[in-house]
Every structure is written in C-alpha cells, then in structure tokens.
C-alpha cells in the first residue's frame, strides 16, 4: 500500500520520494531492505538520503532492489517501501515499456505534455524534448517551464516524448531522461460547471475512534479532455498541506476516468487513526474547472458500537 | 469599497474591499462592474480557502485579484486602464458552494466609481 516503483536509466541521476509523508521536521531513515543496511545522509555518496528523498547520482543498475524510509516523529513511526529499478541504456531508439511513464491525451485546445518526476529534482529551464527519439524543433512545439505545449495539434502528433534535463547538485551536473505517450483525441468534446457526485452536500460520514477513514471527492467537468479541472479537499477551509496534521493526507496525484463518456476526477483522502478532534473538523470537497468551483461539506460523526440483543 | 478614481488610459488603480461580521475563509468573492446603460458583468473572482482566481477575458493579463486573510480585505490591482474599463465596481461575497464569474452573490458593496479618460 504504501509501496512506490520507481526506475530510472544508468548513468542517470534518479530521485526517489519516500511514499510516507510527514511535516520536513520529521527525521526520515532510509535503508537498503535486502541487507537492513543504512543509507548514508553524507552527500559525497553517490548514493545518498536527504530527508524524504533518496538520490542516486548517478545512478547504477546494482542499486536496483527495495528500499525502506522510516518516517519519524516524537509520537510515530511510518514505514514506507520504494521499489527501485535501474535499467542499462538501450543502444537503440526504442523506449521499452518498462521505461514509460503515464500515457497523456491532448486535443486541439489541450496538448500540455507535463515532464514525469521533474519536480523533485533540481533543474533550469530550457527542458529538452525529444519525439521518437528525435528533437523536436519548429514554432508549433514550445517548452514551457516543466512541459511542452504543441500548437494546432495533429493526430501526427501522437507518438513518444522524451524529456532531458539537467540535475544540478552541489555544482556537479547529471542528466535524466524521462519518457511518456501522448495520445490525441480528436473527438468534439464540452466542459459544464463541476457535477460533485460523492460526497453529498452535507453528508455525515461515520467513522471509528483510533480506526483509518477515507473520504473520496469524485467530480466529472464534461467530455473529452479538460483544459483545467482539479479536485482536492480542504479542512476547516485550509489546504491539507497548510493544515499541518500528518495523519491527514491527500493521495498524491488525482486518479482520471471515463464515467459515461464524461472526464471525472477522484481524490482520497486519507485519515490515520482517527481521533476526536477530527469529528470537528468541516471537510471540504472542492471541483473547479474554467467555469467555477464547487463545494461539498462533510462531517465525520462517531459510529455507535451495534447492540447485539437476543 | 475604496480605491475609485479618475485615471488616463494606461494608467493604474487599485481598488480594496473590506470584510466585515464574518469569517474570511470558504467564501467566494469577486469584482463586478457596471457601465452605464449596460448590465452589471463580472470581473474577477476569488475563492478565498485556496487562492483560486477566475477572470473576464476582457481584463485576463490587466487585472489582478488577490486578498489579505489577515485584514479581511479583497484588492483588484487594475494596470494597463482602457476607457471601456470606465464602471462602477462592486465587492460581492458569498458563503454558498459555487464560485465562479457566472453565479449569484450574496452580499454586495456600495460600489466605487472608475473613470479611465483617453
């Protein structure tokens, strides 16, 4: 459950995020599973832990295998796994499946082509892109900030796309590489005001003392690819990430589907060992599109245990 | 509201709207404007608990909408003033679930007066 895969090529830097998350303060101890040895914090390693990250720089395909971070608190532990596969760079220009990261779509008014994991490394812009292996020139392809916009999108346009950029640590450069599909959809599609289908306005979600809860926000903005929609939960009208409590948590990433033919989004929220304080809390489900927002409010209320009479 | 004025095109204004009697987070609030002889149109919007802003395409990349939770107050920051932008520029707020250019406030300001001469 709390399990990652993460890959990446030889000779390449790779960065890992532990997939237990807790406030920066919190120490974070990575080990190698296999041998319970300890990876070392000192950043002359080529294999080193920096908080909630592991870096590989470069990386090696012998430090493939899984690897424990320990999230820890005065008052918890948390243990999350990353599993790590580094893979020999192939000699011809075929990315195998293995390598590719999630397929996205565009449409004529939507073709942003986001780079995988470049949020967690260290780079300055211009990104290098590459489709099939080869680098894209020409005014119809822009690269901007950590993705690529291509003008009047062609059904031609379909294909694979490789970002290249640069790690910088401690003034020494590494490279990566990271590749994904992109499909076009050339069907006629229509964005509405967000439809938030789960949670109901107002709903009373019972839950249990010391027990985990999840909370789903699920909303669906028309048909076709979406310019712009986003689900996310607030409490007591604060983001999560503001909020500061570590046992709530938003699943990172918003999982897509295709309810009807129409463009829906779902974000969990995950509540650990629910507490009191927790039952006071307003819940917020918030959809937005380019035409608005849309607000949902959930309680939590504490589940009576059932009475079992004769 | 505060901030009105009289202005030559190109020029700048900055307009505040301060809250009172409620709390500032979960609300939507928004510019809207009314110029003589035509209907009042919304501006700018804000959604106050996550910074999330809605604007006309006739003032996208001019204005800009932003708020102070500590003073409880709203700003439009208006640059690059055209003489079409000339209206009287209302605050609303609104508690319920909706946000966005399209929906219906529930609170409104007095209104302060924008005037942008050629």
């Known amino acids: 459950k709390f399990s990652k895969q993460s890959w990446g090529l030889e000779n390449e830097a790779l960065i890992v995020r532990c997939p237990r998350q807790g406030k920066p303060s919190y120490t974070v101890d990575w080990y190698y599973s296999q041998t319970n040895k300890s990876i070392p914090t000192q950043e002359r390693n080529r294999v080193f832990a920096s908080g909630q990250l592991l870096k590989f720089l470069p990386a090696a395909v012998a430090d493939s295998g899984i690897y424990t971070c320990i999230v820890r608190s005065p008052t918890f532990n948390r243990t999350g796994y990353a599993n790590v596969t580094i893979y020999k760079k192939q000699s011809d220009c075929n990315v195998p499946d293995y390598l590719m990261y999630s397929t996205v779509s565009g449409s004529e008014k939507n073709s942003k082509i986001y780079c995988p994991t470049i949020d967690l490394y260290n780079w300055t812009a211009p990104l290098e892109w590459f489709k099939n292996c080869q680098a894209l020139q020409g005014s119809r392809y822009r690269a901007h900030k950590s993705f690529l916009v291509i003008d009047n999108v062609m059904t031609e346009d379909a294909g694979d796309y490789t970002c290249k950029f640069i790690h910088n640590e401690n003034g020494a450069n590494y490279s990566v590489t990271a590749t994904r599909s992109f499909t076009v959809k050339d069907e006629q599609g229509f964005s509405l005001f967000p439809v938030i289908g789960a949670p109901a306005q107002n709903e009373i979600k019972e839950v249990e003392i010391g027990k985990n809860a999840n909370l789903t926000c699920s909303a669906c903005f028309g048909k076709g690819t979406q310019f712009l929609a986003a689900v996310l939960w607030q409490l007591n009208g604060t983001k999560i990430t503001d909020f500061g409590e570590p046992r709530i948590q938003q699943e990172e990433g918003q999982n897509q589907s295709f309810s009807n033919g129409l463009a829906c989004l779902d974000m969990v929220l995950r509540i650990a060992d629910v507490k009191e304080e927790d039952l006071l809390l307003q819940y917020d489900c918030l959809a937005l599109n380019l035409h608005g927002l849309r607000r949902h409010t959930v309680r939590l209320s504490r589940k009576n245990p059932i009475d079992h009479h004769s | 509201e505060s901030g009105g004025g009289s202005v030559q095109s190109g020029g700048s204004l900055r307009l505040s709207c301060a809250a009172s009697g409620y709390t500032f987070r979960r609300y939507c609030m928004g510019w809207f404007r009314q110029a003589p002889g035509k209907e009042r149109e919304g501006v700018a919007v804000?959604?106050?608990?996550?910074?999330?802003?809605y604007y006309a395409d006739s003032v996208k990349g001019r204005f800009t909408i932003s708020q102070d939770n500590a003073k409880k107050t709203l700003y439009l920051q208006m640059n690059s003033l055209k003489p079409e932008d000339t209206a009287l520029y209302y605050c609303?707020?609104?508690?319920?679930?909706?946000?966005?250019?399209?929906?219906?406030?529930?609170?409104w300001g007095q209104g302060t007066q924008v005037t942008v001469s050629s």
């Open positions: 609303a707020a609104d508690s319920g679930p909706l946000c966005g250019l399209g929906i219906q406030f529930g609170y």
């Open positions: 804000l959604y106050t608990g996550v910074d999330i802003t």
